[in-house]
Interface confidence: low
């Protein structure tokens, strides 16, 4: 998270962490008690799911494996298109005050929403700095209309922008599959953006949960 | 398959400026990285700085900063390279090569930083 | 700027052998580094990116393996058509960095 600040601790408590061994590999959000929704660009063949701090690699976090995920299959790695996934946990969480799913949209919200967007990924861009906690960024919801005109045809139908005018603030690197929470629902994963990140007024794109809650509840049955 | 295809060679006085050109064909051009990279004869690699299309910024090496210019014509599939106030280092071969593209998920894609190159345009500098 | 040291400058090997280079970023980068060959007169290609996966195409002789300072590109049993020039590059950070080249000659 570029410009950002450190998000109050326990304050998201559906925040998860994919590791990558000890490494971070990208943000995730707890829906279920064994399923994590993250964006479809994280997958690998298995994960190292941190559930319940806002430490990476804090010792007492809850740490569970999955070796399953399942892509939107409509995901395209040139546009970027239904960029969501569902990685489904080895062994069920254990739900605690540290540990809760995240609820699902009723509705999409509309521009001028506020939200806040969290994730460990880089706090600089180009060169990295990686943070031990959680850090958050409080950004809008940006029009469909005004977002084309600066992604022009790479914004799909699905995707979400999120910004705040001549901010920097923005999400980067490391923060992908993480959540975008607008009144308290989950409506965006973080997606993609500019690079270098955090250049003012080129918002950050997200998928937009609520076009997929469909897909989500649909794939959780199939592979109870 | 996607392919680049530059401009052909080059003389040039010292003092001069040169523009190379660098034209994609058969995929998908604007939101792909295009970086330029030089090779002297019979040195190495060298990042000049790069450019996504449908962001039109581009960003430069701190050694060419203010000779360099990178643009690129979304209409043409086109990028160009505008190299100014030549000398005699600057005799080398000019790469376009496509980058990753500008996603920045912890995907691996970013670890491809050149994955398809044109075929080069040298450019000699000599009075 | 991140400096790229690659060792050695260049190499003599025969047929068959296992061929091992080097590179060493100033600091870390993560795992965002490639490989690249380069032959006489021809523009370099990509084997190896995000210092381990193998570019389509590429044989599997190649492997990239490394993450965060120290990098290795190995050919596991070196064929004719692989005598050349080898590069590493990061992509970790701008402006994008490449180490110096090994020369992989016949013994």
């Known amino acids: 998270i570029i410009d950002g600040y450190k998000c109050k601790e326990g304050s998201h408590p559906w925040q998860v962490a994919l590791l990558k061994g000890n490494q971070l590999h990208c943000g995730g959000v707890l829906v279920d008690k064994y399923w994590v929704l993250t964006a479809a660009h994280c997958k690998m063949g298995q994960y190292q799911v941190q559930l319940g701090s806002d430490k990476i690699g804090d010792q007492s976090a809850q740490k569970i494996k999955a070796t399953k995920s399942f892509r939107h299959p409509g995901y395209s790695t040139k546009t970027h298109v239904n960029d969501i996934m569902l990685v489904r946990l080895d062994e069920p969480v254990k739900m605690s005050s540290k540990v809760e799913a995240v609820q699902l949209p009723e509705h999409c919200e509309p521009p001028g929403t506020s939200c806040t967007v969290s994730g460990w990924g880089t706090t600089t861009s180009p060169d990295v700095t990686f943070p031990s906690d959680l850090m958050c960024s409080d950004v809008k919801l940006i029009s469909s209309r005004e977002c084309k005109k600066v992604y022009k045809d790479l914004l799909g139908k699905t995707m979400l922008c999120a910004g705040i005018p001549d901010s920097k603030t923005n999400t980067c690197n490391g923060d992908s599959g993480g959540p975008l929470v607008c009144n308290d629902t989950l409506q965006g994963l973080v997606s993609w953006g500019t690079y270098p990140c955090g250049q003012p007024n080129d918002p950050g794109v997200y998928t937009q949960v609520c076009k997929y809650k469909r897909w989500v509840m649909e794939t959780m049955k199939t592979h109870r | 398959q996607v392919q680049l295809v530059q401009s052909g060679a080059e003389v040039k006085k010292p003092g001069s400026s040169v523009k190379v050109s660098c034209k994609a064909s058969?995929?998908?051009?604007?939101?792909?990285?295009i970086s330029w990279v030089r090779q002297a004869p019979g040195q190495g690699l060298e990042w000049m700085g790069g450019i996504i299309p449908i962001f039109g910024t581009a960003n430069y090496a701190q050694k060419f900063q203010g000779r360099v210019t990178i643009t690129a014509d979304e209409s043409t599939s086109t990028a160009y390279m505008e190299l100014s106030s030549l000398r005699s280092e600057d005799t080398a071969v000019y790469y376009c090569?496509?980058?990753?593209?500008?996603?920045?998920?912890?995907?691996?894609?970013?670890?491809?930083?050149?994955?398809?190159w044109g075929q080069g345009t040298m450019v000699t500098v000599s009075s | 700027d991140i400096q790229m040291t690659q060792s050695p400058s260049s190499v003599s090997a025969s047929v068959g052998d296992r061929v091992t280079i080097t590179c060493r970023a100033s600091?870390?980068?993560?795992?965002?580094l490639a490989w690249y060959q380069q032959k006489p007169g021809k523009a370099p290609k990509l084997l190896i990116y995000a210092a381990s996966s193998l570019q389509s195409g590429v044989p599997s002789r190649f492997s990239g393996s490394g993450s965060g300072t120290d990098f290795t590109l190995t050919i596991s049993s070196l064929q004719p058509e692989d005598f050349a020039t080898y590069y590493c590059v990061q992509a970790n950070a701008f402006p994008y960095t490449f180490g110096g080249g090994t020369k992989v000659e016949i013994k």
């Open positions: 090569a496509r980058g990753a593209p500008n996603y920045y998920g912890s995907s691996s894609s970013r670890g491809i930083a050149f994955d398809i």
């Open positions: 600091q870390g980068i993560s795992s965002w």
């Open positions: 058969g995929g998908t051009f604007s939101n792909y990285a």
